[in-house]
Interface confidence: low
Amino acid sequence: VLPAKPENISCIFYYEENFTCTWSPEKEASYTWYKVKRTYSYGYKSDICSTDNSTRGNHASCSFLPPTITNPDNYTIQVEAQNADGIMKSDITYWNLDAIMKIEPPEIFSVKSVLGIKRMLQIKWIRPVLAPHSSTLKYTLRFRTINSAYWMEVNFTKEDIDRDETYNLTELQAFTEYVMTLRCAPAESMFWSGWSQEKVGTTEEEAPYGLDLWRVLKPAMVDGRRPVQLMWKKATGAPVLEKALGYNIWYFPENNTNLTETVNTTNQTHELYLGGKTYWVYVVSYNSLGESPVATLRIPALNEKTFQCIEAMQACLTQDQLVVEWQSSAPEVDTWMVEWFPDVDSEPSSFSWESVSQARNWTIQKDELKPLWCYNISVYPVLRDRVGQPYSTQAYVQEGIPSAGPVTQADSIGVKTVTITWKEIPKSKRNGFIKNYTIFYQAEDGKEFSKTVNSNILQYRLESLTRRTSYSLQVMASTNAGGTNGTKINFKTLSISHHHHHHHHHH
């Protein structure tokens, strides 16, 4: 059987290294060897590249090596396949070397901001040593912020023949680390070089981008002053590297700027003590280059009626997120402030907050919250400078069984009855929402009974017990993950009721 006709011939000129052609089929059923016939020097010369030795037999690739690599030039290539049964020739293919030239990648040696020019990086590189000296090179510059996986690209050409090349990449974010990589090709070529080694550069710092500002209003003190915990953070979209040297705060009662107070701090939180009136608070961050735009907050008067527009709220878990959704009766409200913090018996150590716009839901990755912790989540509607009544819910991202069961005691022991009371498990030990309690009780050497009650019940009267009998009892608290038993207690029912005994005694 004759070999298959060689097809899909593809040739590439590795500049000053070799001229290589490949074809299909890559493997024949029987031993096949190939000849690649080339004409070069614009058709004046011809030669053959052969794969007939044992190392290259049956291998659908062949390379022509210097010194017969002529450039610029047009080559024709024809592949002959031969086996014991005969020869099969490919069609003749035509190759312009400029169109199939592949060169080495360039080498970036500097990615720097230029003093005084904002949001720009200047990339400097060395042209590949092995590249045609006079040819125009086209380039693709890929860049991304250091913590992003998404590459952006810009294409340009360079005609000059200096080995050191420069490109100014503009419209970047201020004070942000960027990763750069560059590839090149002769302008007419269809083959790009590989990508250069990645290099990192940082754009110049600017005055801070801006702040998000929020507050926690605390109950008024005995002397009438209101503690207000102010908190702020870099605005969404601010450069990751942005650092503030400090923050200036000023505040005054509404319509009375004469009473302006100012504070300077390096913290991102500050407690103010305000009177009962409406106050306006302003915060800016600053660094060595200037100040951010002003963040403004209105603190309502103590007796001000706040609007209410959230009607319902649900928290649900997906595989890796906690999603909170709410319904509102006010279509004009499109900004919301979400607060979340652990529901602990002491003052919460971590308090978080985030603004939501143009949505009525908020999502957080589960791994940003601690498993087995209950979180209080509140959503405030914000309409211009007014903050409405919050709607709150609680959520766990993962429930576990309680780390301790309820502490239980037996009261009012009678002949056939007993009242069992138990204490709520401390918040830190619940590990989930307590959905019910189960009372397990058993007479000595007798059958075990159980009674399950709702989580809001902390006392239960057991009846139909046997008189003058020892019982053991424990209460189990259950979450969705399972239950944990409290301490076991023992009691003995009376032989005769106290009431009956006293009555008898008086007669």
Epitope: V240, K243, L245, T266, N267, N287
Partner: antibody, heavy 119, light 107 residues
Framework: EVQLVQSGAEVKKPGASVKVSCTAS????????IHWVRQAPGAGLDWIGR????????KYAPKFQGRATLTADTSTNTAYMQLSSLRAGDIAVYYC????????????WGQGTLVTVSS | DIVMTQTPLSLSVSPGETASISCKAS??????VTWFRQKPGQSPQLLIY???NRYTGVPDRFSGSGSGTDFTLRISTVEADDTGVYYC?????????FGQGTKLEIK
Amino acid sequence: EVQLVQSGAEVKKPGASVKVSCTASGFNIKNTFIHWVRQAPGAGLDWIGRIDPANGNTKYAPKFQGRATLTADTSTNTAYMQLSSLRAGDIAVYYCARYYYVSSYFDVWGQGTLVTVSS
Amino acid sequence: DIVMTQTPLSLSVSPGETASISCKASQSVTNDVTWFRQKPGQSPQLLIYSASNRYTGVPDRFSGSGSGTDFTLRISTVEADDTGVYYCQQDYSSPWTFGQGTKLEIK
């Protein structure tokens, strides 16, 4: 007063780990980077890496990557440097230093913590 | 990694004279060079940042110059208290690297 106070000297066995603390006073570590540098006896200074306490981002010198771990607890204004798989070549004084990104220099250094590795 | 090479490694100067320490980077570090002094048993102290800016409280006898790959620290009218080891350091690219140190001795 602005200062960095480091934990006391440590003696460890080869293969063990050491954790050095660096507590800041007079400033908030969230507004700076904390760098760690070591100095072997009679030798020069060797940069280990840095942490941005505001977000926990770290950068390490290649020779310490995988063995050094930098962490920070902003609630206590403290940075930590842990070095694992200790060997005799790790005997050194370990320094923490504050670096303000906007002014670009180490202006405050800890007093240093001597780590000795001995079987 | 960028290598910072200091010369000389030790220097002995009489009070009142000028001491000069050179620092050469293996590639351009623009002006991202800092100079420190370390006295025996103490932590390093900042002297010069961004190649030529004197840190607050540093006497004007100390001056830094240079850019690209060649940097110099000059101490004019040397005093007895200037004794110690002087280090240059680059923060142009990670990992940040220090020179080997120059020991200055006052005769």
